[in-house]
Amino acid sequence: EVEKTACPSGKKAPEIDESLIFYKKWELEACVDAALLATQMDRVNAIPFTYEQLDVLKHKLDELYPQGYPESVIQHLGYLFLKMSPEDIRKWNVTSLETLKALLEVNKGHEMSPQVATLIDRFVKGRGQLDKDTLDTLTAFYPGYLCSLSPEELSSVPPSSIWAVRPQDLDTCDPRQLDVLYPKARLAFQNMNGSEYFVKIQSFLGGAPTEDLKALSQQNVSMDLATFMKLRTDAVLPLTVAEVQKLLGPHVEGLKAEERHRPVRDWILRQRQDDLDTLGLGLQGGIPNGYLVLDLSMQEALS
């Protein structure tokens, strides 16, 4: 706490300007009017205040706005934002994209801090949902943002926002997250034609079910091996050799290099060796010819 002292004669600040950098902490506290500071917040960033002086300015704003700062002040916090705690930020109501951009700019180049995470949370709550413009902005500053959300949080993302997602934004997403995002992407891109649709949906296919992969195999999509290796194992296993061949097109040759890795390894174990041989890739480990294949999961379901 800064002790309350009277402002010395002639020291009362008529405006926020560079002369204030020569004020001691107690002089700032006594001589700068909090309401003046709030209306001229945009000037603070241009003045080289010390961290200690910024602490005083923050204290003045906290006193003026005990329930949380208004957004007109928040938008111009600049480097003072770095002094805010998540508890401070939880009191804010933030709805403007320009406010969000201004504060993310302050933190640019650093990892997402607890302050930024709280700010984003307040913003999404203020706007009503994680909309396309917000997602555009957040992924520009933090490419891994989408994959930092839980499946529950992702479930509130509207399909229209998926248009803002770039392939690199999904690099660190795990299967549970893609399970949530894939149906949204399918809905978002449903009106596109075959080849355009595949380009857009490709990054999300780690959440695709078997029936959708079967449908894609009928569309000459030529899926690359990198995408195939990210598919859900349970979605790949029921695919026939012919369907995988159609799905991968010329990339089918890449299966040989991946035969010891999931999901290729597990898929090979489910195929008849006769069928695998038709690929001419020398894939081994299929069900030997003459063996009867029992689908035990089907048997259990019937009993």
Epitope: S72, S96, L97, K101, D131, D133
Partner: antibody
Framework: QEQLVESGGGLVQPGASLTLTCTAS????????MCWVRQAPGKGLEGIAC????????TYYASWAKGRFTISKASSTTVTLQMTSLTAADTATYFC????????????WGPGTLVTVSS | DVVMTQTPSPVSAAVGGTVTIKCQAS??????LAWYQQKPGQPPRLLIY???NLESGVPSRFKGSGSGTEFTLTISDLECDDAATYYC????????????FGGGTEVVVR
Amino acid sequence: QEQLVESGGGLVQPGASLTLTCTASGIDFSRYYMCWVRQAPGKGLEGIACIYIGGSGSTYYASWAKGRFTISKASSTTVTLQMTSLTAADTATYFCARGTNLNYIFRLWGPGTLVTVSS
Amino acid sequence: DVVMTQTPSPVSAAVGGTVTIKCQASQSINNGLAWYQQKPGQPPRLLIYSASNLESGVPSRFKGSGSGTEFTLTISDLECDDAATYYCQCIWDGNSYVNAFGGGTEVVVR
């Protein structure tokens, strides 16, 4: 007295280009959204583009307007809207409107300028 | 882009009566909604912002309510001067909201 006035409207041929100007007076122009909104005869309001004056200078466009319309700040008191490849469907009264520093709440509007695209 | 859908149009009521205009957003916008009144040959006039806040100088007969995706403008004690077209608009900034006006509702006062 805060005021916005649009200019540059008139009769143009299909395929032509046109630049509209919004001039502000009595306004602190430093922290506002300035937007263009149009209204075809007997129809509703249709937002075109917005620019954030001060700070980032960000521009935002309606999806239908991207590519053919360009909003820019020409001076401290004027904002322009460049329109290209005009068709009869662009015939409308074009309004400029001032938002706040936070959003598109339009408290101040210009009287509008009529653009007629016809051969 | 967010799509704003207004109903009904036109709506008719007698002087002294009440009219209710509804506006629906295609996605949740919390309280990010404004209402405007427009008369022929004039630019729109702001009535309500942030869903329920009355703009300075606007009579208290105008009342806005709602949140999320469903919003309502109620005009009570209707006067002849209230005959106009009313528009709702999502006020958030960003590309998705530049063209976020409802189609308009004409109010006819008998």
